[in-house]
């Protein structure tokens, strides 16, 4: 079972019977990418969440199936769930950012990310941790994670706690942290880039 398939299933299982019915009706009219067919109405309307997940994956494959599911959820007003689903499917085997949709993941990049390369220096030298937390909150940090970092007494311990969550992040999530660092302490990033 693929990661995206499991994420689609959990999203659909979270819908009430009424919402699942609405989801199926919207699926019948949602715009599709060129080359993809529509799931037949007769079969679609009788499906439960598990059957529908399998049908979405067999018709659209995992990645597009998840994107399509997220589009329909968003159209239903379920923005948070849609965002989490879309973020999860950009993750591969990593953990999904919480809440807000992450931008599409760029092509795989070789080597370590900047924040992994400079972990020790960032723990020692970042002073504006609150800025980072506010920038990451709802995008890659859950409320619990946000509060856990804030509860730490010193900047290094805050950063150490923040880094305890990064093994589960994908490249895009780490880019968000790097962007926040550039905005809050650009001189530090420039210094580390030169080193």
């Amino acid at each position: 079972m693929g990661r995206a398939r499991d994420a689609i299933l959990d999203a659909l299982e979270n819908l009430t019977a009424e919402e699942l019915k609405k989801f199926k009706l919207k699926l019948l009219s949602v715009p599709l990418r060129e080359g993809y067919g529509r799931i037949p109405r007769g079969a679609l309307l009788s499906m439960d969440a598990l059957d529908l997940t399998d049908k979405l994956v067999s018709f659209y494959l995992e990645t597009y199936g998840a994107e399509l599911t997220a589009n329909v959820l968003r159209d239903m007003g379920l923005q948070e769930m849609a965002g989490q689903l879309q973020a999860a499917t950009h993750q591969g085997s990593g953990a999904a950012p919480a809440g807000i949709q992450a931008p599409p993941q760029s092509a795989a990049k070789p080597g370590l990310h900047f924040i992994d390369q400079h972990r020790a220096a960032l723990i020692a030298r970042v002073t504006n941790v609150e800025w980072l937390l506010d920038a990451l909150y709802g995008k890659v940090l859950t409320d619990e994670q946000y509060q856990a970092v804030r509860a730490e007494p010193t900047n290094p311990s805050k950063m150490r706690k923040l880094f305890s969550f990064t093994p589960a992040w994908n490249w895009t999530c780490k880019d968000l942290l790097l962007q926040a660092l550039r905005e809050s302490q650009s001189y530090l990033v420039e210094d580390l880039e030169r080193s």
Partner: antibody, heavy 124, light 107 residues
Framework: QVQLQQSGAELARPGASVKLSCKAS????????INWVKQRTGQGLEWIGK????????HNNENFKGKATLTADTSSSTAYMDLRSLTSEDSAVYFC?????????????????WGTGTTVTVSS | DIKMTQSPSSMYASLGERVTITCKAS??????LSWYQQKPWKSPKTLIY???SLADGVPSRFSGSGSGQDYSLTISSLESDDTATYYC?????????FGSGTKLEIK
Amino acid sequence: QVQLQQSGAELARPGASVKLSCKASGYNFTTYGINWVKQRTGQGLEWIGKIYPRSGNTHNNENFKGKATLTADTSSSTAYMDLRSLTSEDSAVYFCARSPYAFYSSSYWYFDVWGTGTTVTVSS
Amino acid sequence: DIKMTQSPSSMYASLGERVTITCKASQDIKSYLSWYQQKPWKSPKTLIYYATSLADGVPSRFSGSGSGQDYSLTISSLESDDTATYYCLQHGESPFTFGSGTKLEIK
């Protein structure tokens, strides 16, 4: 902090039913699943089933079909398990446990937080 | 159902000793394997998830490894507080199934 507070011990007659509760606090109840686990005295752990609190959808272990019914009340952030037609085999400690979803974690449906446990004793 | 075979069922070890507990699944569980510690009359406590990730607040002497069907929990240097029963759980496929447990005691 995140807590799952379970209801107090139950003493029931054979054939009766009991309803156990698991009150969640410290997080958004609808963004995680809830599992129920059985442990007989001196024995191992057995998964009963899971519920998606937002929708009420459930998945039960076949061994507990007809025995355990899982429900959730989002307004009070409480999950419930009804155990019916009780026999001495149902005497056990029952735990609830929280799980993240597949679109929320790298490892969905593992049990990240456990409840305090409820002891059920079935005796005539 | 996926069967989880956990070994040993019980063991004695000395303080400071390296301890390893294993779990074998009857089929590939794709690292959807977690480990739990339970002390008498207490709720279980999560130690490891996704086979190798350390849960919040768990001492670094605990580690998990493995993939496919074979997984292990290692305590690098046993402490007196580690006396407990340890369980593995596969949660990749319903019904979720636990190992039978390993009771760990100090020599």
